[in-house]
């Protein structure tokens, strides 16, 4: 089973219900919507930090990206078969210390979610 770590920094639309409802689809880094193409939000929104307790697969733990970083979630649609219950989500929360986060200033105040079934593009191409 592959898992991908996903990120977002400035999600204006995050609320607690969307965290539980949308955990089945990979969340997008909201950095991605403040781009040169003119899309996206600019404000930072504080939200609790959490990460799943399951380890990432070896393919994801590269020397260039060994650290756990965080993400907020903005998913309007969900895939029922992939969605976890609030109970399952709660079981997977882990609170990290500041030293463990090692986050960039631009990437603070965010959550981390990992995608249970999302194989990388390279793996899908094999």
């Amino acid at each position: 089973e592959s898992r991908a770590e996903l990120t977002s920094d400035k999600d204006m639309y995050l609320d607690n219900s969307s965290i539980e409802e949308a955990s089945g689809v990979y969340p997008i880094d909201d950095d991605d919507y403040a781009s040169a193409s003119g899309s996206g939000a600019d404000e930072d929104v504080e939200s609790p930090e959490l990460t799943t307790s399951r380890p990432l697969p070896k393919i994801l733990l590269t020397s260039a990206a060994p650290k756990v970083e965080t993400t907020t979630l903005n998913i309007q649609n969900k895939i029922p078969a992939q969605t976890k219950s609030p109970e399952e989500t709660d079981k997977e929360k882990v609170h990290l210390s500041d030293s463990e986060r090692k986050m960039d200033p631009a990437e603070e105040d965010t959550n981390v979610y990992t995608e249970k079934h999302s194989d990388s593009l390279f793996k899908r191409t094999e």
Partner: antibody, heavy 122, light 112 residues
Amino acid sequence: EVQLVESGGGLVQPGRSLRLSCGVSGFTFSSFGMHWVRQAPGKGLEWVAVISNDALHKNYGDSVKGRFTVTRDNSRNTLFLQMTSLRPEDTAVYYCAKDVVRGHTSGSLGSWGQGTLVTVSS
Amino acid sequence: DVVMTQSPLSLPVTPGEPASISCRSSQSLLYSNGYNYLDWYLQKPGQSPQLLIYLGSNRASGVPDRFSGSGSGTDFTLKISRVEAEDVGVYYCMQALQTPLTFGGGTKLEIK
């Protein structure tokens, strides 16, 4: 704010080489896969290449395979596209784009640069 | 390679009216994890493309809810419930299932 700025484009003769750069800011560059996509004048989008966050994995579009090489310097927050044996049909605006998933290349392109124009002509 | 085919090529729409764009792939984009690796992008005049929809039906952050994506396998649809003037541009579908990533030819949405 995420920013991607391409540079290095210009007029080049067929058969010659050119190196494009993409400088980024506003996110942890070393955590994201990066792509190059091009658009010939008045035409649609064509994917060119992808490189994983750690530079261990690379893939190319059929039309550039063997001629173009994608690299990155994570210490300088810069993505490169080395183009050799250039052809007139390589004339296009070249965009760099950031993958949307950290530490894992999803294939979805969340942030795009403004593009740099490469013209291959004698 | 996966071939992506979009229709129509051009789509004149009256503001406030709905619009629909079709995208077909030469092979199924439904992966074993249950996700369809199909994205929609909009390139507004003079701008870089921007991501609208990913994994077939999920709106990217900041994208108005009048945009929706649907479909599975080889047939996908982007719908705009009520077109606004700012929606003009060229819409592209793209398969992200495997490399080489491939785009549809584009659909130019214009205001009547």
